[in-house]
């Protein structure tokens, strides 16, 4: 479906102003920050979805071990530049001409640089480990009924092909999630799983970013799964490239 | 639009099995569950149970050993079946919508049927 | 099993007065990573289903009037009717859905 005809609103997308004005009078909705006009059908981008936010007002053995070229976000929240189709620019620049290369994700994969830092391509990040601990239970969740449920909140709710989510670890009380998609695997109108991913991280944060009743409210049989610690791991098609003194 | 109907025989005798249907229209039986309340007369609600989206059911503890929930997708049908009933299980019945992931609230309710255990 | 406990049974307000209705549960409703309450507030008319009002303790839901207001985290929960209307006549229940779910005993909302 696209924008909500009745109020128009984008169920996919909070941060959006919407109006009335397109083809015909249907519903169109421009994303916060950008302006752009999102298709309310589907996941609004990440670089979107970021801009949005700066814009807006301020107020062991079955588990994986990240790979050693593992990103995480540490740098955490900037003002980014999108391209038109709402992906990263490979290289993002802040208001003191400090620049550097980011993935698809938006996460930096360089040392910082000035403005003569050259990103030659934006790098996809094909694998995603989402790492969350839960508050305890009264015992462990069952790992297949855990494992159903949580690939179907990808399916249903992000939109997420099935075959993309590759695994669904779970050693009490931490499970894991993992993500493939390579870029010959996606297919024109494949949700991306970066952006899955954000969604997901917003969802259990309980900033949601669908419109409605505002949070996630995840069950495995019945009983609520309350994530108290989540981490993102995400590993690039090519490795990133810092300097050793980072690495110290 | 979304739709939930319940249906079922008005009079039950005592000892018999309250049988009941839920017939949903407007949402996949796939991506949201059902669930059953019900109200004697001139009381409150009590929840009875539960089958969500991905099949699995919970039940109110004071009525599991009597209580089955089912439901047949190809009829957009749930079922709900107490066994052993008494003049106490008399109340309107009322099956209502699981909101998924939005959070197990009941936004939309069919308009109930009255079920009377008398013999 | 989660108790929750309706106070007052029944309440008499005039038109344009403030009516509260308080709501315990036996257990927080909390849920610590997303620090939202596991709490909805029905309506309920005679001869008509409930009908939700708000939900994760403090949400309106769409349509409803914003004279309804909820309050509370943890155990303490409150919905208000800022100035009553005479269509607000009705029974008001609380539901908890942090272990399953339990409704509160109701109160009645009355006219003076």
């Known amino acids: 479906h696209t924008a909500a005809q009745d109020n128009c609103t984008c169920p996919t997308n909070k941060m959006t102003v919407c109006s009335p004005d397109g083809p015909g009078g249907r519903c169109q909705c421009r994303a916060l920050g950008s302006g752009v006009a999102v298709d309310c059908s589907t996941l609004t981008s990440e670089c979107l979805l970021l801009k949005a936010r700066m814009s807006a007002p301020k107020n062991a053995r079955t588990l994986v071990r990240p790979n050693e070229h593992a990103l995480v976000d540490n740098d955490g929240l900037y003002d980014p530049d999108c391209d038109p189709e709402g992906r990263f620019k490979a290289r993002q620049c802040n208001q003191t001409s400090v620049c550097w290369c980011v993935n698809s994700v938006g996460v930096r994969r360089t040392d910082k640089g000035d403005l003569s830092l050259r990103c030659d391509e934006l790098v996809r990040t094909h694998h995603i480990l989402i790492d969350l601990r839960h508050r305890p239970t009264a015992g462990a969740f069952n790992h297949s009924d855990l494992d159903a449920e949580l690939r179907r909140l990808f399916r249903e709710r992000y939109r997420l092909h099935p075959k993309f989510v590759a695994a669904v670890h779970y050693e009490q009380p931490t499970i894991q999630i993992e993500l493939r998609q390579n870029t010959s695997q996606k297919a024109a109108g494949d949700v991306d799983i970066g952006d899955a991913a954000y969604y997901f991280e917003r969802d259990v944060k309980g900033e949601s970013l669908f419109q409605g009743r505002g949070g996630l409210d995840l069950r495995v049989r019945g009983e609520p799964l309350q994530v108290e610690r989540t981490l993102i791991y995400y590993l690039d098609e090519i490795p990133p490239k810092f300097s050793m003194k980072r690495l110290t | 639009q979304v739709q939930l109907q319940e249906s079922g025989p008005g009079l039950v005798k005592p000892s018999e099995t309250l049988s009941l249907t839920c017939t949903v229209s407007?949402?996949?039986?796939?991506?949201?569950?059902v669930n059953w309340i019900r109200q004697p007369p001139g009381k409150g609600l009590e929840w009875i149970g539960v089958m969500w989206a991905g099949g699995s059911t919970n039940y109110n503890s004071a009525l599991m050993s009597r209580l089955t929930i089912s439901k047949d997708t190809s009829k957009n049908q749930f079922s709900l079946k107490l066994s052993s009933v008494t003049a106490a299980d008399t109340a309107v019945y009322y099956c209502a919508r699981d909101e998924n992931w939005d959070g197990a609230w009941f936004a939309y309710w069919g308009q109930g049927t009255l079920v009377t255990v008398s013999s | 099993d989660i108790v929750m406990t309706q106070s007052p049974d029944s309440l008499a307000v005039s038109l344009g007065e403030r009516a509260t209705i308080n709501c315990k549960s036996s257990?927080?409703?909390?849920?610590?990573?997303?620090?939202?309450?596991?709490l909805a507030w029905y309506q309920q008319k005679p001869g008509q289903p409930p009908k939700l009002l708000i939900s994760?303790?403090?949400s309106r839901e769409s349509g409803v009037p914003d004279r309804f207001s909820g309050s509370g985290s943890g155990t303490d929960f409150t919905l208000t009717i800022s100035s009553l209307q005479a269509e607000d006549v009705a029974v008001y229940y609380c539901?908890?859905?942090?272990?399953?779910?339990?409704f509160g005993g109701g109160t009645k909302v009355e006219i003076k």
């Open positions: 994760w303790a403090s």
């Open positions: 539901k908890q859905s942090y272990n399953l779910f339990t």
């Open positions: 407007g949402f996949s039986l796939t991506s949201y569950g």
């Open positions: 257990q927080s409703l909390l849920n610590s990573g997303t620090r939202k309450n596991y």
